[in-house]
């Protein structure tokens, strides 16, 4: 594998200035997959810098990324999805730094959407539902979801619930009465595919009802 140092002492002898990270999204546009890379240092001068991916591709040896402001992007059907690809930062055809990456280990799901909360008076609970485009996908179908909610006044006091379905029940007794709550959800791959949390869904806001005391009951 040309371009690689041959031993452990030299293995990281690359230009740290050009360190980058990438994520993949499978079937993000019909059957097209995408790969997005960006430099970790936002101050890198990206003029004349290019990204290229080689290996673990169908029908082609290498593909070049398109540059969109400060990110580099490919949309293609040509990912083999098995084996490691070599992703390189290049200038004038010369590699500055490269990473071997298996695209199935850097998957970032699409954000969940249509989050809503319905109060069930009889059951004294809140039914949280949301949707995900991954239910329709053929590859990254199995996700773990992270539902986060907080009382609006408690800025950093988020409660988290992990679930694999798209429906969650919150018991009224576990929430403060007459309070405004914010809730949001994100997803991460959970079967074979590995990677990163999606972006958060748009937040949904709901108010809890006041406590209805039965006749004869006293306020505490």
């Amino acid at each position: 594998e040309s371009g690689y140092a041959q031993n452990g002492d030299l293995e990281d002898a690359e230009l740290d200035d050009y360190s980058f990270s990438c994520y993949s999204q499978l079937e993000v546009n019909g059957s097209q997959h995408s790969l997005t890379c960006a430099f970790e240092d936002p101050d890198v001068n990206t003029t004349n810098l290019e990204f290229e991916i080689c290996g673990a591709l169908v029908e082609v040896k290498c593909l070049s990324f398109r540059k969109l402001q400060e990110i580099y992007f490919i949309e293609t059907k040509k990912f083999l999805l098995i084996g490691k690809s070599n992703i390189c930062v290049k200038v004038g055809g010369k590699s500055l730094t490269c990473k071997k990456i298996d695209l199935t280990t850097i998957v970032k799901p699409e954000a969940p959407f249509d989050l809503s909360v319905i109060y069930r008076e009889g059951a004294n609970d809140f039914v949280v539902t949301f949707n995900t485009s991954h239910l329709q996908k053929k590859y990254v179908k199995v996700l773990m979801h992270d539902v986060a909610y907080r009382q609006e006044k408690d800025e950093n006091k988020w409660m988290h619930v992990n679930l694999s379905s798209t429906k969650l029940t919150l018991l009224q007794r576990n929430l403060q009465p007459e309070a405004m709550y914010e809730i949001k959800v994100r997803s991460i791959p959970d079967h074979y595919f590995k990677g990163f949390w999606s972006e958060w869904s748009p937040s949904y806001y709901f108010r809890t009802p006041e406590i209805n005391n039965s006749p004869g009951e006293m306020d505490p």
Partner: antibody, heavy 118, light 111 residues
């Protein structure tokens, strides 16, 4: 060229431990996970576990968990497999193998014979 | 654990003839078009050698008389025209789920 070179044959007594090494060369050590595969005499292949030299993260076959430890030394591009509480059934050839992708093995060491005998 | 069943256990084929080895898994090892099945060749006294990865992708340097096919739970390794140097034991392996398991092996000999 890409090579995995393993340490030499070992003879051990039941209850003892053995530590086998696998030195990688010809590629950037942290780019590929390295795994260990067991082959008992006249038998098939059995995956023991693997290690990611970049992070030191490991994955072990439940069957060997508690008895196997995999480590890596980036300074020498070497991975190690230690197997403890040896028994006669551990007599086998142990191969280290590079994972070209998740999880197939594109480069193999020459094998290390471990004999467990009282 | 996913159980890998290879058939036949052994196979005698004339030089130049086709050899076909099957591997059946106890559950699917495919995710849509991603087939997590691989094939190895092992000659006596040598380590295994990767032939096919992802069910049908030929490893670099492997002669194109070797081919793989299949999806789900049923996979096949084919040697289109058996050569003397192909005498070996062949193993299938799945990588969809830990522990990554191998078939019991198929011994290919010259008839």
């Amino acid at each position: 060229q890409v090579q995995l070179v393993q340490s030499g044959a070992e003879v051990k007594k039941p209850g003892a431990s053995v530590k086998v090494s696998c030195k990688a060369s010809g590629y950037r050590f942290t780019d590929y996970e390295l795994h260990w595969v067991k082959q008992a005499p006249g038998q098939g292949l059995e995956w023991i576990g693997g290690i990611d030299p970049k992070t030191g993260g490991t994955a072990y076959n439940q069957k060997f968990k508690g008895r196997v430890t995999m480590t890596s030394d980036r300074s020498t591009s070497t991975v190690y497999m230690e197997l403890s509480s040896l028994r006669s059934e551990d007599t086998a050839v142990y191969y280290c193998a590079r994972s070209g992708g998740r999880w197939y093995f594109d480069v193999w060491g020459q094998g290390t014979t471990v004999t467990v005998s009282s | 654990d996913i159980v890998m069943t290879q058939s036949p256990d052994s196979l005698a084929v004339s030089l130049g003839e086709r050899a076909t080895i099957n591997c059946r898994t106890s559950e699917s090892v495919s995710i849509h078009l991603l087939h997590l099945m691989h094939w190895y060749q092992q000659k006596p006294g040598q380590p295994p050698k990767l032939l096919i990865y992802g069910a049908s992708n030929l490893e670099s340097g492997v002669p194109d008389r070797f081919s793989g096919s299949g999806s789900g739970t049923d996979f096949t390794l084919t040697i289109s025209s058996l050569q003397a140097e192909d005498v070996a034991v062949y193993y299938c392996q799945q990588s969809i789920k830990d522990p990554y398991t191998f078939g019991g092996g198929t011994k290919v000999e010259i008839k």
